[in-house]
């Protein structure tokens, strides 16, 4: 990761993708340490911030403007050399977001996938973006970039992610950029949580008072396991919703969550999954499906338990 013999390594924390008005720390790592360094911007725009200045350990940039977007390099202090400075570092591209309308992000076949599968994340917009960028939250590496394909007044790009492993689970956002301003990105798409299932043993799902109930009768679905899951997730077939609850340790040494569905109006097939707090987007195998039947006069379904999963913050911790 570090630079060569006389080449520092320039990196950004927390990310090279910075929202307009945000801050970012640039670190110049040179010769097994963070020394004094100088910073350069390749297109030489916005240079007053670096004007003859030497920085110590890190440079905090911000609040950023579109003019901050571009390619940076640093030189480390090398007192006994002819120039006093090292060779230039690797190039580091800083991208500033929030400059155009947000694109949309969709997952095909969907955001809930089995380990080893491949998902296509499609970013699209009616703004004629030249490039699309896909970024996973919490990752400091540069985002993936694709050229936008334009059809019928829509620009889009398909990012293939897979085979899916736990490290690829998480919250994704995409951005677009227009010609001539490649590092001035749009506002982020709404976040899309990619969840990987099938990594741990399946929990069991049961219904109280039972899987067949009278219309209007209160129903509770219980998800439990011997595994010490922190969170249980309940999904209903045909709905892009998931409901989650913290697992509670029981006296029989199982971990359980009870999902009250309220008065029964309509049946459905339910599944539940377990997950751990440390990896909120990596779920267990699905429980066996549970068919809940309602006898009497079925009308509409139960009220939606949560917002659609792409916006529900599955991959954020449940506090």
């Amino acid at each position: 990761l570090m630079g060569g013999q006389d080449k520092p390594f320039l990196s950004a924390r927390p990310s090279t993708v910075v929202p307009r008005g945000g801050h970012v720390a640039l670190q110049c790592h040179y010769r097994r340490g963070f020394n004094n360094f100088m910073l350069y911007k390749e297109d030489r725009s916005h240079v007053p911030i670096f004007h003859g200045r030497i920085f110590q350990e890190s440079f905090i940039m911000g609040p950023v403007t579109p003019a901050h977007a571009g390619t940076y390099r640093c030189r480390g202090s090398r007192p006994h050399s002819l120039t006093g400075w090292s060779a230039p570092s690797n190039p580091l591209v800083i991208m500033v977001t929030g400059n155009h309308r947000k694109p949309s992000l969709l997952a095909h076949p969907g955001p809930l996938l089995k380990s080893g599968e491949t998902v296509i994340l499609q970013c699209w917009s009616d703004v004629m973006f030249e490039h699309f960028f896909l970024h996973r939250e919490g990752i400091s590496e540069d985002p993936s970039r694709l050229v936008g394909q334009i059809h019928d007044g829509v620009s889009k790009a398909n990012f293939s992610i897979g085979p899916l492993m736990p490290v690829l689970a998480g919250t994704y956002r995409c951005y677009g950029s227009v010609p001539h301003s490649p590092y001035q990105l749009s506002a982020p798409s709404d976040p899309l949580d990619i969840v990987i299932t099938g990594l741990y043993e399946k929990p069991s799902l049961s219904a109280q008072p039972g899987p067949t109930v009278q219309a209007g009768e209160n129903v509770t679905l219980s998800c439990s396991s011997w595994s010490s899951y922190d969170i249980y997730h309940l999904s209903r077939e045909g709905e892009a919703h998931e409901r989650r609850l913290r697992a509670v340790p029981k006296v029989n040494r199982t971990f359980q969550a009870d999902f009250p569905l309220g008065p029964a109006t309509h049946g459905g097939t339910y599944r539940c999954f377990g997950s751990f707090r440390a990896l909120p987007c990596v779920w267990s195998n699905s429980s066996d499906p549970l068919l809940v039947s309602v006898t009497g006069n079925p009308s509409s379904s139960w009220p939606s338990p949560t917002e659609p999963s792409s916006k529900s913050g599955i991959c954020r911790h449940l506090h």
Epitope: H23, A25, F34, F55, Q56, S58, I60, M61, G62
Partner: antibody
Framework: QIQLVQSGSELKKPGASVKVSCKAS????????MQWVRQAPGQGLEWIGW????????KYAEDFKGRFVFSLDTSVSTAYLQISSLKAEDTAVYFC???????????WGQGTTVTVSS | DIVMTQSHKFLSASVGDRVTFTCKAS??????VAWYQQKPGQSPKLLIY???TRHTGVPDRFSGSGSGTDYTLTISSVQAEDVAVYYC?????????FGGGTKLEIK
């Protein structure tokens, strides 16, 4: 939303020390720095210096070297300003403000009044 | 140190007026100028940085311009809530320095 909350007013005797705290929330503390500014009664704004919350490296304006010390506790997203050997002329409102190497102070604390009087 | 001079200590305007604050730097500060608003009994608030970039949530009646050593902050249509002291600051080189402030009063 981004907030900086400072500790309460202080009344001190000349020669004493005071430590002002500034607790940040709503952003990742270590990706920005904390600037410190003071405002004497009825006067304008005077920059004391700043601390890089990522590296912990402080920088002081010439007039504030020695008696003024910045510190951080990143585990609780808090910056501190300690002033020792207080003098009557240190009586002022002390502000913390988020900002980095570019010197733009985009969010400010509510201010802490330090009164030095015998 | 760079000295920032706000020559007017006071400005008076009626609601709806256009008002301009001026600030002069003792040397070229390459557009690295910010403007702050401080209402009575409150902490300063950032309005403008890099001469003309409006901070998040700042109404578009506030705008900035300038280059070299001369900078201005304009309020296109003054509102009663704009009563405050306005400070310019150079963020070109340390020590960051502020102007003495201009107090806006409503007639």
């Amino acid at each position: 939303q981004i907030q900086l909350v400072q500790s309460g007013s202080e009344l001190k005797k000349p020669g004493a020390s005071v430590k002002v705290s500034c607790k940040a929330s709503g952003y990742t503390f270590t990706t920005a720095g904390m600037q410190w500014v003071r405002q004497a009664p009825g006067q304008g704004l005077e920059w004391i210096g700043w601390i890089n919350s990522h590296s912990g490296v402080p920088k002081y304006a010439e007039d504030f070297k020695g008696r003024f010390v910045f510190s951080l506790d990143t585990s609780v997203s808090t910056a501190y300003l300690q002033i020792s050997s207080l003098k009557a002329e240190d009586t002022a409102v002390y502000f913390c403000a988020r900002g980095g190497d570019e010197g733009v102070m985009d969010y400010w604390g509510q201010g802490t009044t330090v009164t030095v009087s015998s | 140190d760079i000295v920032m001079t706000q020559s007017h200590k006071f400005l008076s305007a009626s609601v709806g007026d256009r008002v301009t604050f001026t600030c002069k730097a003792s040397q070229d500060v390459s557009t690295a100028v910010a403007w702050y608003q401080q209402k009575p009994g409150q902490s300063p608030k950032l309005l403008i940085y890099w001469t003309s970039t409006r901070h998040t949530g700042v109404p578009d009646r506030f705008s900035g311009s300038g280059s070299g050593t001369d900078y201005t902050l304009t309020i296109s249509s003054v509102q009663a809530e704009d009563v405050a002291v306005y400070y310019c600051q150079q963020h070109y080189s340390t020590p960051w320095t502020f102007g003495g402030g201009t107090k806006l009063e409503i007639k």
